[in-house]
Amino acid sequence: QRLPRMQEDSPLGGGSSGEDDPLGEEDLPSEEDSPREEDPPGEEDLPGEEDLPGEEDLPEVKPKSEEEGSLKLEDLPTVEAPGDPQEPQNNAHRDKEGDDQSHWRYGGDPPWPRVSPACAGRFQSPVDIRPQLAAFCPALRPLELLGFQLPPLPELRLRNNGHSVQLTLPPGLEMALGPGREYRALQLHLHWGAAGRPGSEHTVEGHRFPAEIHVVHLSTAFARVDEALGRPGGLAVLAAFLEEGPEENSAYEQLLSRLEEIAEEGSETQVPGLDISALLPSDFSRYFQYEGSLTTPPCAQGVIWTVFNQTVMLSAKQLHTLSDTLWGPGDSRLQLNFRATQPLNGRVIEASFPAGVDSSPRAAEPVQLNSCLAAGD
């Protein structure tokens, strides 16, 4: 499903990825156009009754009729009953010798809060982004990336870890969310769906995109990841939606062309260094930001999420390669590796641009604008 363009917002600068689909409110379909994509049913990290989203968390949308081809529950992977969301929250990274975070999967046992109690926390990720409810924060300046253009050597480790494809990044990739908010990149990985089924983790007004890239960063205030886990701002993730476009994305092809080599779960290969920034949208000035969690166990909270307004374009063939090449645990395809969207529970998503300003027909409706928390100060 593609988002119809109502009022195109040209990106700043020409991105090498050829992406040109911003996510401002003006580009979102009306409620009639946009059914909420179904999340995996009965997922183990579903909120308890006390965590059920309020009106501000979920878009009011009309369910699509079956004739319109809505995604049915029986089409999705079966999962076990939800785990007990009452377990105490614990953001601490468990010691490697203890109950590690490797024994989990999308759907089924064990329930994620049993793997890591933090997965039952109140401020989890991913979330549904409603641009009209985002607080415009002029203090959110354009992101700064330094050292992301890597030389071919040394090569980088690309691994099928059974949950995603992950590229480990070398030291020296610096990212700033703003003055005094400095990070270094650790790794990037992707989330995707299956044939005809989108698989982004975040959604926009209930719309799920074909795929999503996450670049995970560690705050320079911490020497080690385990020190930063669960600490506010200890980790930061840059996220961008991947959409279908007419042309092959040459930056992504450098990775996608190697997936066949790591089709088997646990397999890994070396890839030449590349321009990591070319995997992201070109417009670093327009984004949404909120505090959430890792989207997989240990689900540690305090993670600063920055979701680009602009999307990245891949060809249909490339999106198919991404979703149809890798294998996961138990001889099953590695597909639909996204977590259900989690309730905001009062969190306000901030925007670096006036995302709620709308000239589409919906502007006639009352617009609720949240106030900026000035997180960028």
Epitope: S102, P154, L156, Q187, E264, G266, P329
Partner: antibody, heavy 122, light 107 residues
Framework: QVQLQESGPGLVKPSETLSLTCTVS????????WSWIRQPPGKGLEWIGY???????NYNPSLKSRVTISVDTSKNQFSLKLSSVTAADTAVYYC????????????????WGQGTLVTVSS | DIQMTQSPSSVSASVGDRVTITCRAS??????LAWFQQKPGKAPKLLIY???SLQSGVPSRFSGSGSGTDFTLTISSLQPEDFATYYC?????????FGQGTRLEIK
Amino acid sequence: QVQLQESGPGLVKPSETLSLTCTVSGGSISSYYWSWIRQPPGKGLEWIGYIYYSGSTNYNPSLKSRVTISVDTSKNQFSLKLSSVTAADTAVYYCARRGYDFLTGYDYFDYWGQGTLVTVSS
Amino acid sequence: DIQMTQSPSSVSASVGDRVTITCRASQGISSWLAWFQQKPGKAPKLLIYAASSLQSGVPSRFSGSGSGTDFTLTISSLQPEDFATYYCQQANSFPITFGQGTRLEIK
């Protein structure tokens, strides 16, 4: 606490196949990489290869034609077979777990067996 | 294969001394470097991984630094139990390779 224990014959004849098993206790063999590393007497360490719990393998090219590593998740064991051995294969053989930092992607040999000396001699 | 060269091959030091062992890779290995301690008749013990991350349970007197081709293991104040052989190991590319070892002896 994860523990690894190598077992197998301490003496193998030249041209025969060396067979060792590593039993993992105190933790599951699932979701990790399991390696074999050897150390000739008085010398340094040489990586032989690894197997992922699902069966994916990677071998040292210098030994690849003679090495097979397999895993039995039901027994929490993995095994090494080295064919056509010579005296140069005499070494202490260690099994080790190759841990994996889920966030950074970096890995490391964090748990080792105590090692077993295998002598190749007629 | 990536060659790992340690220096010195052996070093004599006293309890309380600060000791530095270096490891050089024949080509860039980013931060894919680990340091091990091995005592006679025992298996190697992981001290440092990812060039500078201290393994759980390892005393803080051990530290690692470097990236690319040049790496350092530092023991800030030698203790009697630190006399052993130390190995560096790269995991940037296969095959995984080890340095030849540095023997730390009592002066």
